[in-house]
């Protein structure tokens, strides 16, 4: 059926009309209230505030950052936490409250000129001349996910696999790209016969993990050519 085709992990030669998705756990958007909840209605209030799941710092409020609530906690479960004040320990700029930044593991006050210089230097090193519109003062929008974040967890949007945490790769999911788990031994994988021969895959799988390769599963040799199952196997 169309739905079972849609739900296969790697869809090739996309038959219209597939695709399009929204939402995943731990990453509802913390947009400015005026965007999702305009007009000053009650949805803007935080009466019933509860820990808010996130995948990136930018999804949290200006005075929050995204992290696991417990030290050494489950990396997959992250919530928006209150920003850290001056002289508190930090690992990245986004952890520090507005007007501060992370230097040598401590939140310090931003001497604006100095702070801006440090940011631009970091960007230039990592991303070439990608700072033409940088405003060193608007911390939350300019220190975007590509810079001061911890690596993306499963489900985080990414541009390349280096954006993702260890054990994850950056792969297509619907029309976007997210961090997905690198495949383990015995897991189904996608084998492309030739580069460019596979059509549109809107649900890409990651590659097989270290020491594994994507090969035809032994008991599927007899199956028809089109339905042969490939799995990650030891070299």
């Amino acid at each position: 059926t169309l739905n079972s085709v849609l739900n296969s992990n790697a869809i090739k030669n996309l038959p219209p009309p597939l695709g399009g998705a929204a939402g995943h756990p731990g990453s509802a958007v913390s947009a400015a209230p005026g965007i999702l909840y305009p007009g000053g209605n009650k949805y803007q209030t935080i009466d019933n505030y509860q820990p808010y799941p996130c995948a990136e710092d930018e999804e949290c409020g200006t005075d929050e950052y995204c992290a696991s609530p417990t030290r050494g906690g489950d990396a997959g479960v992250q919530i928006c936490l209150a920003c850290r004040k001056r002289r508190k320990r930090c690992m990245r700029h986004a952890m520090c409250c507005p007007g501060n930044y992370c230097k040598n593991g401590i939140c310090v006050s931003s001497d604006q000129n100095n702070f801006r210089g440090e940011i631009e230097e970091t960007i230039t090193e990592s991303f070439g001349n990608d700072h033409s519109t940088l405003d060193g003062y608007s911390r939350r929008t300019t220190l975007s996910s590509k810079m001061y974040h911890s690596k993306g967890q499963e489900g985080s949007v990414c541009l390349r696999s280096s954006d993702c945490a260890t054990g994850l790769c950056c792969a297509r999911h619907f029309w976007s790209k997210i961090c997905k788990p690198v495949l383990k031994e015995g897991q189904v994988c996608t084998k492309h016969r030739r580069k460019g021969s596979h059509g549109l895959e809107i649900f890409q799988r990651c590659y097989c993990g270290e020491g594994l390769s994507c090969r035809i599963q032994k008991d599927h040799h007899q199956a028809s050519n089109s339905s042969r199952l490939h799995t990650c196997q030891r070299h």
């Epitope: 297509r172 619907f174 549109l200």
Partner: antibody, heavy 114, light 112 residues
Framework: QVQLVESGGGVVQPGRSLRLSCAAS????????MHWVRQAPGKGLEWVAV????????YYADSVKGRFTISRDNAKNTLYLQMNSLRAEDTAVYYC???????WGQGTLVTVSS | DIVMTQTPLSLSVTPGQPASISCKSG???????????LYWYLQKPGQPPQFLIY???NRFSRVPDRFSGSGSGTDFTLKISRVEAEDVGIYYC?????????FGQGTQVEIK
Amino acid sequence: QVQLVESGGGVVQPGRSLRLSCAASGFTFSGYGMHWVRQAPGKGLEWVAVISYDGNDKYYADSVKGRFTISRDNAKNTLYLQMNSLRAEDTAVYYCARELRVLWGQGTLVTVSS
Amino acid sequence: DIVMTQTPLSLSVTPGQPASISCKSGQSLLHNDGKTYLYWYLQKPGQPPQFLIYEVSNRFSRVPDRFSGSGSGTDFTLKISRVEAEDVGIYYCMQSIQLPWTFGQGTQVEIK
């Protein structure tokens, strides 16, 4: 802040063209698939088009196929909808929408009238 | 296209009383990634959609906890435990597992 802001709407005569823009800010725009959705006055929402994160793949609703073109400029964090051969039935508020962590803009009104 | 059918189409509720809206999809919205791509949103006149619930049961940031979503596969429900005056408007369900994204016809909620 994380937001989408549409612009380019207005009053246009049938058969003419219009280009809508959607400026994204506060998130990694180039990693997300982006959609256009519209709402005719007093009606429900209708999905219009999608473009993949890299701009390589596009898909359209039958009602706009061949007339509308979705595109994006990741360097400018901007999504576009080029609307040609406009008809009265294209009159609607047009919203750009981000998938996965769903986010919509405030919308821009397009009125097609002679 | 996946057809989304909402019931009832209109609901008149006394403040403080509960309200419940049903949404049925023409096919399962469960993806093999384990997620079910069903949303609920509220729309007020002249305003864009205000998203309330994502993936069946997860509340968006700063949505009051009187809103809750439940269901699986093809049958879904939005519940408001105690309706307040500002909850009036049209509630829609939406699926995004398959293009085109499709929407319920809407349920108009008004205060008695």
